[in-house]
């Protein structure tokens, strides 16, 4: 006998990075049906919703009116039908932006490069901060972590065309405040390669959705284009 | 120490051809790409192309593209470029560059001279 | 492609004076700005990296600012041996560019 219900799915609408003072919208997915859903911040209850009619619902959000920094961290939800409960969510980590300070992006040698040239980005913020992150627009998972007191090395090795785009980085006060965005540096990679199998190129979205292009790979679904990113999710645990 | 070593002087004919060649030296080759610039006599410098040995992508200048090389062979850390088609306004001296960033590192130089 | 002017093509300083060289790109490059000392029968020397960035080996005296389109390449004061031809390189895309250099030559 089935003693829990399947989990919810749990994202952030538009984006799980949230400006500071800018408006978000927590959603939880369950089962038609479902009577109650809770939403749980950093393990402790924060809200319930009870959707009416249930048996026409299977989806509730919780909105933010206003992110700040308290409002950062992990989110999780659980839904109830009858006296069952769900499973809890996967943990939806809500990340406040824009906060102090603007890093600065490079990348060397240059913007443009020739295929299988070693690339290394470099992200430089004044404040202190220690951690950094590296995101690249596009459909697919380009989130890459970074140490250093005031600036963090993000080596990309050899390139291929598949590394083309977009890229900016923040400086993170903690796991779930991070700083402006960096401007945007797009990396070319030029070259005719012979007897060489390269990456095909990730699609990208324009550059003013590039907040929106993370997917989860949970579901290989996209909702709304504002599923939260598995990938970039588990890099802040 | 870092070092590039470039072939000799040559003196050719217009229409023929010339390969000039770079061994490098006190570094990985196969973790810089290597550039050409070329410099006629009493002239500024002017990039040709440059190769990326480990996988040997290329990029050209448009100006030559068609009628230069860019080569590398990583047994022998040598880069080579080849230049067709020669003309009297293709005398200068080549240079090959490690690009790392800048060109950090430059060979010596070779004459082209191209006279009928 | 980026065009990169320099100017002036010939400036005369007096040694022990500075000396200010200018390259202007004709779109922005950042900071990915280079510049190169060349002196006759030699191969060019890197001098300064990334608009600003001091190179090993390089007397304290070069060094260079700008961002974006304009740059400078200063010489705080001038030794004898600095007097030859200084170039710029656009470092940001290709075709990878040169000014026309700037010869500097004693007054």
């Known amino acids: 006998q089935q003693q829990t219900l399947p989990k919810p799915f749990i994202w952030a609408e538009p984006h799980f990075m949230v400006p500071k003072e800018k408006q978000v919208t927590i959603c939880c997915q369950g089962n038609y049906g479902a009577v109650e859903y809770q939403l749980h911040f950093e393990g402790s209850l924060f809200a319930v919703d009870r959707p009416k009619p249930p048996e026409r619902i299977n989806k509730v959000q919780f909105y933010i009116p206003d992110m700040n920094s308290r409002m950062a961290g992990q989110y999780s939800c659980i839904y109830r039908v009858g006296e069952l409960w769900s499973e809890p969510s996967n943990l939806l980590d809500l990340v406040v932006t824009e906060m102090y300070d603007t890093p600065t992006l490079s990348v060397h040698p240059g913007p443009e490069v020739i295929s299988g040239e070693k690339v290394t980005f470099y992200c430089r913020l004044d404040t202190a901060t220690s951690m950094f992150l590296l995101l690249k627009e596009g459909r697919s998972s380009h989130v890459q972590r970074g140490y250093g007191k005031v600036q963090a090395e993000f080596p990309l090795g050899p390139v291929t065309t598949a590394h083309r785009g977009t890229y900016r980085c923040f400086g993170s006060y903690n796991n779930h405040a991070w700083s402006f965005p960096s401007e945007p540096v797009k990396l070319l990679v030029t070259g005719d390669i012979e007897n060489t199998s390269l990456a095909p190129e990730d699609p990208t979205f324009p550059a003013d959705t590039w907040g929106t292009y993370l997917l989860t790979t949970e579901t290989g679904l996209q909702k709304d284009h504002a599923l939260w990113d598995h990938t970039a999710q588990n890099l802040l645990r | 120490q870092v070092q590039l070593v470039q072939s000799g002087a040559e003196v050719k004919k217009p229409g023929s051809s010339v390969k000039v060649s770079c061994k490098a030296s006190?570094?990985?080759?196969?973790?810089?790409?290597m550039h050409w610039v070329r410099q006629a006599p009493g002239q500024g410098l002017e990039w040709m192309g440059g190769?990326?040995?480990?996988?040997?992508?290329?990029s050209y200048n448009q100006k030559f593209k068609g009628r230069v090389t860019i080569t590398a062979d990583k047994s022998t850390s040598t880069a080579y470029m080849e230049l067709s088609s020669l003309r009297s306004e293709d005398t200068a001296v080549y240079y090959c560059?490690?690009?790392?960033?800048?060109?950090?590192?430059w060979g010596q130089g070779t004459t082209v001279t191209v006279s009928s | 492609e980026i065009v990169m002017t320099q100017s002036p093509a010939t400036l005369s300083v007096s040694p022990g004076e500075r000396a200010t060289l200018s390259c202007r790109a004709s779109?922005?490059?950042?900071?990915?700005l280079h510049w190169y000392q060349q002196k006759p029968g030699q191969a060019p020397r890197l001098l300064i990296k990334?608009?600003?960035q001091s190179i090993s080996g390089i007397p304290a005296r070069f060094s260079g600012s700008g961002s974006g389109t304009d740059f400078t390449l200063t010489i705080s004061s001038l030794e004898p041996e600095d007097f030859a031809v200084y170039y710029c390189?656009?470092?940001?895309?290709?075709?990878?560019?040169f000014g026309q250099g700037t010869k500097l030559e004693i007054k």
């Open positions: 560059a490690r690009r790392g960033g800048s060109f950090d590192y």
């Open positions: 006190g570094y990985t080759f196969s973790e810089y790409t």
């Open positions: 190769i990326s040995p480990n996988i040997g992508g290329t």
């Open positions: 779109q922005s490059i950042s900071d990915y």
């Open positions: 990334y608009a600003s």
């Open positions: 390189q656009n470092g940001h895309s290709f075709p990878l560019t």
